[in-house]
């Protein structure tokens, strides 16, 4: 049998946020029902994780031997602290789209570990704020965006923006 440390060396995690409790659930991406040491995990999920606090999980299973895999869960900031904001100026709304992630509330997570991604059509931007210029008037554009903490996606949003009519004579 392999050690659990080896077997789960490359385990990945998804973070799910509960807006009512303001707590996260970490979903462990494994094929079998693992045990989580002191942390109880149900259906490979570790519940009630506080934003920006690290949690240590000891992963074991009867298909592997000691030592267990020690997984450090880097819990992201609360999702409601981020808002996708349309920053397009009214006078330029016929040919321009501006989108910005606003941090309306502080958090204790290291901001260095947060990355932002926008995808508008086939254009990809790794920025917190984007401005698309020289667009076609009266066209619909869809922009998808996500935020990652330590390369784990923890929230996403999409906006469909229709550019205004062009000025007469243009």
């Amino acid at each position: 049998k392999p050690t659990c440390d080896e077997k789960y060396a490359n385990i990945t995690v998804d973070y799910l946020y509960n807006k009512e409790t303001k707590l996260f659930t970490a979903k462990l991406n494994v094929n079998e029902d693992v045990e989580c040491g002191n942390n109880t995990c149900t259906n490979n999920e570790v519940h009630n994780l506080t934003e920006c606090k690290n949690a240590s999980v000891s992963i074991s299973h009867n298909s592997c031997t000691a030592p267990d895999k020690t997984l450090i869960l880097d819990v992201p900031p609360g999702v409601e602290k981020f808002q996708l904001h349309d920053c397009t100026q009214v006078e330029k709304a016929d040919t321009t789209i501006c989108l910005k992630w606003k941090n309306i509330e502080t958090f204790t997570c290291d901001t260095q570990n947060i990355t932002y991604r926008f995808q508008c059509g086939n254009m990809i931007f790794d920025n917190k704020e984007i401005k698309l210029e020289n667009l076609e008037p009266e066209h619909e554009y869809k922009c998808d965006s996500e935020i990652l903490y330590n390369n784990h996606k923890f929230t996403n949003a999409s906006k469909i923006i229709k550019t205004d009519f062009g000025s007469p004579g243009e």
């Epitope: 920053c87 910005k100 309306i104 509330e105 502080t106 260095q112 990355t115 917190k128 704020e129 401005k131």
Partner: antibody, heavy 119, light 113 residues
């Protein structure tokens, strides 16, 4: 190491122009809003310009509006302050400072660069 | 514009004593979102300012717990429970509620008595 390094300060005559630069390193510059803050010879701190992370929004106090322009080049990790129609009261130490968003705080400051406006 | 007035201008203290600095804003700096964006910065001689406190009472990471911030509306206070030699310098309050018209207080110089 997270660092901001200002440059471009000089002695300039009233009515003259000057461009300050602030080189950022050790962090994802394009994710941070940035500001210029100056300190007068009397040691008063004054905020003089603000720019959002992507350069879309800029703000200035009335004392410098129309004379100062803040800009950034995220590809070069550099913040700029173009100053024109300089007055003697613009004499100060100019600091660039990082602010994650408008509702956050200035958590990293540069060491400053000195601008002297005098004939 | 929001005017931030600090008192006293100079504060002579003995090491180990408590120090208290007051900051008063000319109008309420409670934002419509309920938060109060009042910050305190310390500038030591020959250095750039460093953040101590944000949102009235939150200590920035690495700031010793002898520093505490309090207040609401227009009246705010920074307290240092036991002054140490490394605390000497000029303290500035700052309001970030009236975006983008940020304003600093005039500063309070903490010095040895």
């Amino acid at each position: 190491e997270v660092q901001l390094v200002e440059s471009g300060g000089d002695l300039v005559k009233p009515g003259g122009s000057l461009k300050l630069s602030c080189a950022a390193s050790g962090f994802a510059f394009s994710n941070y809003d940035m500001s210029w803050v100056r300190q007068t010879p009397e040691k008063r701190l004054e905020w003089v310009a603000y720019i959002s992370s992507g350069g879309v929004s800029t703000y200035y106090p009335d004392t410098v509006k129309g004379r100062f322009t803040i800009s950034r080049d995220n590809a070069k990790n550099t913040l700029y302050l173009q100053m024109s129609s300089l007055k003697s009261e613009d004499t100060a130490m100019y600091y660039c400072a990082r602010r994650y968003d408008v509702w956050w705080y200035f958590d990293v400051w540069g060491a400053g660069t000195t601008v002297t406006v005098s004939s | 514009d929001v005017l931030m007035t600090q008192t006293p201008l100079s504060l002579p203290v003995s090491l180990g004593d408590q120090a208290s600095i007051s900051c008063r804003s000319s109008q309420s700096i409670v934002h419509s979102n309920g938060n109060t964006y009042l910050e305190w910065y310390l500038q030591k001689p020959g250095q750039s300012p460093k953040l101590l406190i944000y949102k009235v009472s939150n200590r920035f990471s690495g700031v010793p717990d002898r520093f505490s911030g309090s207040g609401s509306g227009t009246d705010f206070t920074l307290k240092i429970s036991r002054v140490e030699a490394e605390d000497l310098g000029v303290y500035y309050c700052f309001q970030g509620s009236h975006v983008p018209m940020y304003t600093f207080g005039g500063g309070t110089k903490l010095e040895i008595k």
